[in-house]
């Protein structure tokens, strides 16, 4: 039975040209996290973090995506095209798969505020 819960940073905004941390956290389960995948709104992979083999960054994003902190992902040099949904997929044993959603809005304004609160989707 899947008892876990994914908490995410929810809806966040950040300034064009700046950076943002995408963060998910799996709680309420003793399952072993074997891999975390980070995907964009069109379900294309940004990065994979395998528990044993480490981070794998999609080549097209290697200059704009930094691993971490932790199982999270840092997006840098943000453009307006980065606006949209991001998904963290936790592959676990024995529970199976957990998925969290984050919505990122990239703003032109210099007053863009990066909210770092965690919420349960």
């Amino acid at each position: 039975m899947m008892t876990g819960t994914i908490e995410t940073t929810g809806n966040i905004s950040a300034k064009k040209g700046g950076s943002v941390i995408l963060q998910c956290h799996l709680s309420s389960t003793m399952a072993q996290v074997t891999q975390v995948n980070w995907e964009q709104h069109d379900h294309s992979l940004l990065a994979i973090r395998n528990a044993e083999l480490g981070w794998h960054i999609y080549p097209a994003f290697k200059d704009r995506v930094a691993p971490g902190p932790g199982l999270g992902l840092t997006l840098q040099s943000l453009t307006m095209n980065d606006t949209g949904e991001y998904f963290c997929t936790y592959h676990t044993y024995p529970d199976g798969t957990y998925r969290g959603r984050i919505f990122l809005e990239v703003l032109e304004s210099s007053v863009a505020e990066h909210s770092a609160r965690f919420q349960i989707p």
């Epitope: 395998n50 083999l53 794998h56």
Partner: antibody, heavy 120, light 107 residues
Amino acid sequence: DVQLVESGGGLVQPGGSLKLSCAASGFTFSSYGMSWVRQTPDRRLELVATINNNGGSTYYPDSVKGRFTISRDNARNTLYLQMSSLKSEDTAMYYCATRTGTEILGFDFWGQGTTLTVSS
Amino acid sequence: DIVLTQSHKFMSTSLGDRVSITCKASQDVSTAVAWYQQKPGQSPKLLIYWASSRHTGVPDRFTGSRSGPDYTLTISSVQAEDLALYYCQQQYSTPWTFGGGTKLEIK
């Protein structure tokens, strides 16, 4: 040049045990996760064990869980696979493999393999 | 576990021909697919990763592509040294799994 050299294969009876070794050179062994991949006589490939760079995290598929143990000695640049309660279906060529660089998704370095035969 | 199906165990081709080796995933694996080549008596060699990224030193006649759950390794003009076994592998979900292999042979 990266080199992975497996050893320790042989003929074992069902229920027996064996320990394979993989000597690594040409890269900073302690910085990389490592895997064992086997190839059965019908040429199928199966990932059987993976370990992180410091040995603190391991992964096994259900087919070998509880019977195989992966470990490493970073001081000796050596990867190990301890196999017990061996079955005829464990008969295979065993390769150690790794990948370098965070862009690579897959195994870009493989050893030459060592053969395990489980038979009475 | 995710199953990768290489429906052709053998493929016959002529030197200079264009050939496409296919791999179908049982569920979405996005771009987390690699292709390997294995020649007789050798260990597998990485050709393609992230579905379409060519590994260092791999000739540009090898191309990887994706259409939904179907992944294709294309050799634009088959050379004698390309006659080998080809495997796909997914890394989207643990355990990472391999296809059953396709053996490329000369007609």
